[in-house]
């Protein structure tokens, strides 16, 4: 956004920001806005929280339109009331080993976090906490009513789930790439991030991509067939253009989205790929952003618990990214 014009703000008064989020002036020094937080999309008009040492990382200079809020190199992390230095590792609980990297906490699960899909020998998988054990384990529940028999089992399909890319050694560099995190939004345009050292300098860097698990305006429950409880990957009737902060994708996409369930299960991306998408902005500028495209979704009971940010992150992470 060009800052040379007169300042005019939205008609409503200054916004009320959530606890811990700063009320700041936009990048033009015009209007009061709630500062964007770590990992959120930012623009010149929607700045990152300066009180947390964040800046808007636009990536390549050609894309100075929309970026991701990133902590300055070497920024410490505040986690659970404790301050950790950048590069410091710590165990947050028996389930997670965490590392602070430039203001962001990244955690690897110490427990298996695989998504287990129904199969003929285990049609109703469920995770349970066993006494005396830290990690939850899979158990196979019996169906409540014995109606799934015979040909109906053909509806079950084993899906490949992939863990992190196998580590590689390349020119004295142990290449490691974490899984893509869950999309920051359950509907609409969000971002997904990962950490990798798969670069020429073997230096840890944060990568991000746009993601859309499902459109917000879609009323997906209406499409669930009679007698069914889920619609896993609903058919999108027409190709769509993606929108990002006033810019529109130059191409239309017949994208897949994840559906919904009516029985408490949640549907999340299972296999994804990352492709570049070009956006054209009202001022004619074109920018290229990487975006997640869904190949398959999985519906499961491992829905993220609101009280556990790590389960939220790792039960919903993206498996099998092809890019």
């Amino acid at each position: 956004q060009n800052c040379s014009g007169p300042c005019r703000c939205p008609d409503e008064p200054a916004p009320r920001c959530p606890a811990g989020v700063s009320l700041v002036l936009d990048g033009c020094g015009c209007c009061r806005v709630c500062a964007k937080q770590l990992g959120e999309l930012c623009t010149e008009r929607d700045p990152c929280d300066p009180h947390k040492g964040l800046f808007c990382d636009f990536g390549s200079p050609a894309n100075r339109k929309i970026g991701v809020c990133t902590a300055k190199d070497g920024a410490p992390c505040i986690f659970g009331g404790t301050v950790y230095r950048s590069g410091e590792s710590f165990q947050s609980s028996c389930k997670y080993q965490c590392t602070c990297l430039d203001g962001a906490v990244g955690c690897m699960p110490l427990c298996s976090m695989d998504v287990r899909l129904p199969s003929p020998d285990c049609p109703f998988p469920r995770r349970v906490k066993l006494p005396g054990k830290c990690c939850e384990e899979w158990v196979c529940d019996e169906p409540k009513d014995q109606t799934v028999v015979g040909p109906a089992l053909a509806a079950y399909r084993l899906e490949d789930t992939f863990g992190p890319d196998p580590t590689m050694i390349r020119a004295n560099c142990l290449v490691q790439t974490t899984e893509w995190s869950a999309c920051s939004k359950t509907c609409g345009m969000g971002i997904s991030t990962r950490v990798t050292n798969d670069n020429a300098s073997c230096r840890l860097e944060k990568q991000s991509r746009l993601c859309m698990v499902r459109p917000c305006e879609a009323d997906l429950e209406e499409n669930i067939k009679k007698g069914k409880k889920c619609i896993r990957t609903p058919k999108i009737s027409k190709p769509i253009k993606f929108e990002l902060s006033g810019c529109t994708s130059m191409k239309t996409y017949r994208a897949k989205f994840c559906g919904v369930c009516t029985d408490g299960r949640c549907c999340t991306p299972h296999r994804t790929t990352t492709l570049p998408v070009e956006f054209k902005c009202p001022d004619g500028e074109v920018m290229k952003k990487n975006m997640m495209f869904i190949k398959t979704c999985a519906c499961h009971y491992n829905c993220p618990g609101d009280n556990d940010i790590f389960e939220s992150l790792y039960y919903r992470k993206m498996y099998g990214d092809m890019a």
Epitope: Q1, N2, S4, G5, P6, C7, R8, C9, P10, D11, E12, P13, A14, L25, C28, G29, C30, C31, R32
Partner: antibody, heavy 119, light 111 residues
Framework: EVQLVESGGGLVQPGGSLRLSCAAS????????MAWVRQAPGKGLEWVAN????????DLLASLKSRFTISRDNAKNSVYLQMNSLRAEDTAVYYC????????????WGAGTTVTVSS | VVMTQTPLSLPVSLGDQASISCRSS???????????LEWYLQKPGQSPQLLIY???NRDSGVPDRFSGSGSGTDFTLKISRVEAEDLGVYYC?????????FGQGTKLEIK
């Protein structure tokens, strides 16, 4: 009652300086932009400058930028116009105005203070 | 952006309708999509007062006999039934582009 009261005007020689003040009352000062608008004798209105909530952004009429400065002190509910190297053509009534920064511009005006530049 | 008002003087009888035109030298649509065209009245010996903002919105306390309309570069202020207290100089103003500019003023006076 919402009120703006200007002060600091007077007679000054060409090349001289003046500092106009505007004291605001009756509203939350830091929730509004403030502005200065002037009116030469027998002439129309001319926008001079405005300033954002905290004083971190100021916009001035390009022809006045090198000589005039707008500033504010939210603790004192006041806005100022520092005028240097004054010329005869700066002679005018200077109005302080509240700028909503949203739908409308100048929704409250002061009574004005007269600046006369003459030798 | 130059704002040109017509007429410069408008003699009216009390109770008549009055219409003032304001034309901008270029489109005054702000980059946010709004048109910041305003009308001010300066009564004799007084400070200006806001009447209309964003082309057609009356400021609080402004009688409904005042109405604003227009788009692009052509705008109009109408007073449906002129009253004695309406006399003075009317200015249009654009706040969409720098420098912010006023029209030269239209003097509404009794015939």
């Amino acid at each position: 009652e919402v009120q703006l009261v200007e002060s600091g005007g007077g007679l000054v020689q060409p090349g001289g300086s003046l500092r106009l003040s505007c004291a605001a009352s009756g509203f939350t000062f830091s929730d509004y932009y403030m502005a200065w608008v002037r009116q030469a004798p027998g002439k129309g209105l001319e926008w001079v400058a405005n300033i954002n909530y905290y004083g971190s952004r100021t916009d001035l009429l390009a022809s006045l930028k090198s000589r005039f400065t707008i500033s504010r002190d939210n603790a004192k509910n006041s806005v100022y116009l520092q005028m240097n190297s004054l010329r005869a053509e700066d002679t005018a009534v200077y109005y302080c105005a509240r700028d909503t920064s949203r739908g409308s511009y100048f929704d409250v005006w002061g009574a004005g203070t007269t600046v006369t530049v003459s030798s | 952006v130059v704002m040109t008002q017509t007429p410069l003087s408008l003699p009216v009888s009390l109770g008549d309708q009055a219409s003032i035109s304001c034309r901008s030298s270029q489109s005054i649509v702000h980059y946010n999509g709004n048109t910041y065209l305003e009308w001010y009245l300066q009564k004799p010996g007084q400070s200006p007062q806001l009447l209309i903002y964003k082309v057609s919105n009356r400021d609080s306390g402004v009688p409904d006999r005042f109405s604003g309309s227009g788009s692009g570069t052509d705008f109009t202020l109408k007073i449906s039934r002129v009253e004695a207290e309406d006399l003075g100089v009317y200015y249009c103003f654009q706040g969409s582009h720098f420098p912010l500019t006023f029209g030269q003023g239209t003097k509404l006076e009794i015939k």
